[in-house]
Interface confidence: medium
Amino acid sequence: AGVFELQIHSFGPGPGPGAPRSPCSARLPCRLFFRVCLKPGLSEEAAESPCALGAALSARGPVYTEQPGAPAPDLPLPDGLLQVPFRDAWPGTFSFIIETWREELGDQIGGPAWSLLARVAGRRRLAAGGPWARDIQRAGAWELRFSYRARCEPPAVGTACTRLCRPRSAPSRCGPGLRPCAPLEDECEAPLVCRAGCSPEHGFCEQPGECRCLEGWTGPLCTVPVSTSSCLSPRGPSSATTGCLVPGPGPCDGNPCANGGSCSETPRSFECTCPRGFYGLRCEVSGVTCADGPCFNGGLCVGGADPDSAYICHCPPGFQGSNCEKRVDRCSLQPCRNGGLCLDLGHALRCRCRAGFAGPRCEHDLDDCAGRACANGGTCVEGGGAHRCSCALGFGGRDCRERADPCAARPCAHGGRCYAHFSGLVCACAPGYMGARCEFPVHPDGASALPAAPPGLRPGDPQRYL
């Protein structure tokens, strides 16, 4: 058992152009909070899959109000760590999702109270009990800096929190077969709680609840001595029926040591000698350094000279993630203005501009009305890359050259007759109808039936925002 701890250092605009607008304003003050979701192994990072290792929500940060027009600075953060307790062994390899949420505090009634600002995800190797690992992740134009670690809750110790430690009973040394607990040298490694009744002299366990027998003993609780007179081999799993030691695999058979570790038998079990860059009971945990080349796609590795110090990958343009493992969809930042089409060519971004716009990011609005004339007193209106004429009354068409007949569209309902007028049109309604367009029937009692508002939503099942 233990606790995964996450410390958020900063959340703000990332480097480079296109700084995001502040999520808060004088009209809409807000505060941030964070959610972390952990999953064991290199599992799916999809936000919807369950947080099998656990999840945590931070406290709310201080209320923040941005000055109008100012770029977003690093935003004020909640106090304290995010802590995710884990009950079983720490897996060594895990996936994380960290979400930054905004809580709106403005005086508005509509809309949800919360909105997601950024979500980052990654996969990491981490030994419990190790130092804080630092990380930087980007989501769109935002950048999140954080540190994390896994620590065991006493009495558990070790890189997976599976070993147990107890205070020494004797002041000088630990009991037979028990090692001092590094780094707590004044404590001793305690035997795991084995299956009830497991012989303390002839049995042992590597997992809680099991009972494995030392050489020469057999039975479910290792209480039956093995008769070796009729046996050929001096070791192997015991046969409870014959009381004879049957040849079988030793603890190193099949090499339980991962990542090229070498196995050696011990009186109780086995021991792995791990190659450089790996540690743990079975060499399953990677202590990655820059020498191991952890940065992909041409990323530059900095720091991390030894397994106890974290490394940072500086990614080339177009890549992100702690190991530069993710290609950036640069078009997701919507760099092309005014409805331009974004093309990510790998080496560069290209914007294909709509008519009436130009520039590398379609930022220049061409003067649509230059050299254009609207007839009959019409005025030219720019917009959307094409000029448009706002025509004087009685004229229409692209350049206001056509005489407009306001009655051409038959605007009077229920058989009303239309008359062109200098101010537009007038409807003379048929008997039984009224209104500017003769749209309302007149009831015999003189009351008019006005149209009902469209029906609203009906309450239904739970709806999801995301």
Partner: nanobody, 116 residues
Framework: QVQLVESGGGLVQPGGSLRLSCAAS????????VNWYRQAPGKEREKVAR????????NYANSAKGRFTISRDNSKNTLYLQMNSLRAEDTAVYYC?????????WGQGTLVTVSS
């Protein structure tokens, strides 16, 4: 399972008062923003009042300002709406709704009729 149950509706004369309650169960009520909505016959549903998860922030529609008060008791998982100076145009089915950043839930509604 998740439930929101409104109560306290009924017939009241213009100028009178009513207190609506909404009892929540099956989810972590204290982490949700909660709202009162209403829907009059033939009209769109409108949000009347909103209160943040901790109860520190309240918002009201213009039609409710100065007359309605929204409150909550997280220890009892209950939302309230105190309605004073009721008018005929307040006649509607009133719904409570709980919303958070990942989900939202609705009650079935309670009818408020303001008539002399």
């Amino acid at each position: 399972q998740v439930q929101l149950v409104e109560s306290g509706g009924g017939l009241v004369q213009p100028g009178g008062s009513l207190r609506l309650s909404c009892a929540a169960s099956g989810f972590d009520f204290s982490t949700y923003t909660v709202n009162w909505y209403r829907q009059a016959p033939g009209k769109e549903r409108e949000k009347v009042a909103r209160i943040s998860s901790t109860g520190t922030t309240t918002n009201y529609a213009n039609s409710a300002k100065g007359r309605f008060t929204i409150s909550r008791d997280n220890s009892k998982n209950t939302l309230y709406l105190q309605m004073n100076s009721l008018r005929a145009e307040d006649t509607a089915v009133y719904y409570c709704a709980a919303e958070r950043f990942d989900s939202n839930y609705w009650g079935q509604g309670t009818l408020v009729t303001v008539s002399s």
